[in-house]
């Protein structure tokens, strides 16, 4: 969490941003809140990016003002206009790409004063893993697949029965570049699996951590997946 204040004491307002991550090929949200004003026409929101000459987005007098917008962001940005009055200056970014990563500044002007806060925005790819029993294998084998990751993640297997065991010797992980030549498909195979046990396939990079669990008994197979973003720090 980053909390920024205006420069001149009495005329400063609190602006708060949260470091976040964007999944490339989807819309992303850059979070920013501020002390609200009672009059929408008195609020100015400017989003800037370090190293970019033009503005990322500007909202003033109750509407978008995009004449100074940088070409890189043309047609891709929006604030939640109906929520500005309650202090939400968050930015929606369409079709996030790797190049959108960087340091952004949320700069606010209201009748109470000015304030700003920086936000670190990471971009990458992350997806839910799916763990299945590989019936084609000669021994009891589990196969963990996740379609899109970037940067290259680490993959670790764990088991409920053998807690703390190191499965690196009995697993094999491969990374296959996807057609857009950025993200990769993750495939990890775990050998010598025992029945009546819960196994977890944990995939992690500096942006996200995802876990796929599978419980194999003689009568049924139960699966569960979970994904968590790692870098949500507020400023």
């Amino acid at each position: 969490l980053i909390i920024g204040f205006g420069i001149s004491g009495r005329h400063s307002i609190t602006v708060t941003t949260v470091a976040s991550a964007g999944n490339i090929g989807e819309d992303g949200i850059l979070s920013c809140t501020f002390e609200p004003d009672i009059k929408l026409s008195d609020i100015v929101i400017q989003w800037l990016k370090e190293g970019v000459l033009g503005l990322v987005h500007e909202f003033k007098e109750g509407k978008d003002e995009l004449s100074e917008q940088d070409e890189m962001f043309r047609g891709r940005t929006a604030v939640f206009a109906d929520q500005v009055i309650v202090g939400n200056a968050s930015l929606r970014l369409k079709n996030v790409q790797l190049t959108d990563a960087g340091t952004y500044k949320c700069y606010i002007i209201t009748s109470k004063g000015k304030g700003n806060a920086n936000l670190e925005y990471k971009t990458g790819a992350f997806s839910m893993p799916e763990v299945n029993v590989d019936y084609n294998a000669s021994s009891e084998t589990l196969r963990c697949e996740a379609p899109r990751w970037f940067p290259q993640p680490t993959v670790v297997w764990a088991s409920q029965v053998d807690q703390g065991a190191n499965f690196s010797e009995v697993s094999n992980t491969s990374f296959e570049l996807n057609s857009e030549n950025v993200t990769m498909k993750v495939v990890s195979v775990l050998y010598n699996v025992t029945i009546n046990n819960t196994y977890s396939c944990m995939i992690e990079n500096d942006i996200a951590k995802a876990t796929g669990d599978i419980k194999v008994t003689e009568s049924e197979i139960k699966r569960r997946s979970h994904l968590q973003l790692l870098n949500s720090k507020a400023s």
Partner: antibody, heavy 116, light 109 residues
Framework: EVQLVESGGGLIQPGGSLRLSCAAS????????MNWVRQAPGKGLEWVSV???????DYADSVKGRFTISRDNSKNTLYLQMNSLRAEDTAVYYC??????????WGQGTTVTVSS | EIVLTQSPGTLSLSPGERATLSCRAS???????LAWYQQKPGQAPRLLIY???SRATGIPDRFSGSGSGTDFTLTISRLEPEDFAVYYC??????????FGQGTKLEIK
Amino acid sequence: EVQLVESGGGLIQPGGSLRLSCAASGFIVSRNYMNWVRQAPGKGLEWVSVIYGSGRTDYADSVKGRFTISRDNSKNTLYLQMNSLRAEDTAVYYCARDADYGMDVWGQGTTVTVSS
Amino acid sequence: EIVLTQSPGTLSLSPGERATLSCRASQSVSSSYLAWYQQKPGQAPRLLIYGASSRATGIPDRFSGSGSGTDFTLTISRLEPEDFAVYYCQQYGSSPLYTFGQGTKLEIK
């Protein structure tokens, strides 16, 4: 040249299924938001479905649960699987690329007629 | 659900005249996510304007877009014979993800 070419339309009975294809050239389908948009005879444009660059999908309420959008990255091709077809699904179906700032590339359209 | 209402439904003008087409949204739309398309009979739509006011590649400068919030306008400063067609506005970002207006037919007077 950047191009989209649809195929797979035709005459189908109510309740039937059809799969539309959209072959792309000159750009990579998986880097863009790819859409299906339809136009009933004499009517306006109606958005049907999107597949994001990430592979996630979204649908108009009118087709949710009946239509499935997908893509084959190796073939650079977009698909629309249409099941439980109804008379009101009769339309010209266009695939369109949204290159961040609007649907800038459209196919020529393929006609789907649902009639008994 | 955001509804886009275009007016007039039909606009009858002569070549050389100025055309003003309106698109009104039922709730606020980001200027970035507002586009205009032209469609001629038997053809696919063509992107004219994106981001409410930016001309798409290859679009003549007689076409211009303006507006913000809930009111957007497409202006054709001097009508050419090839400009007579149906025009649609479209928004992105709400549910449904994309919404089109019902269209304005620009016909020769």
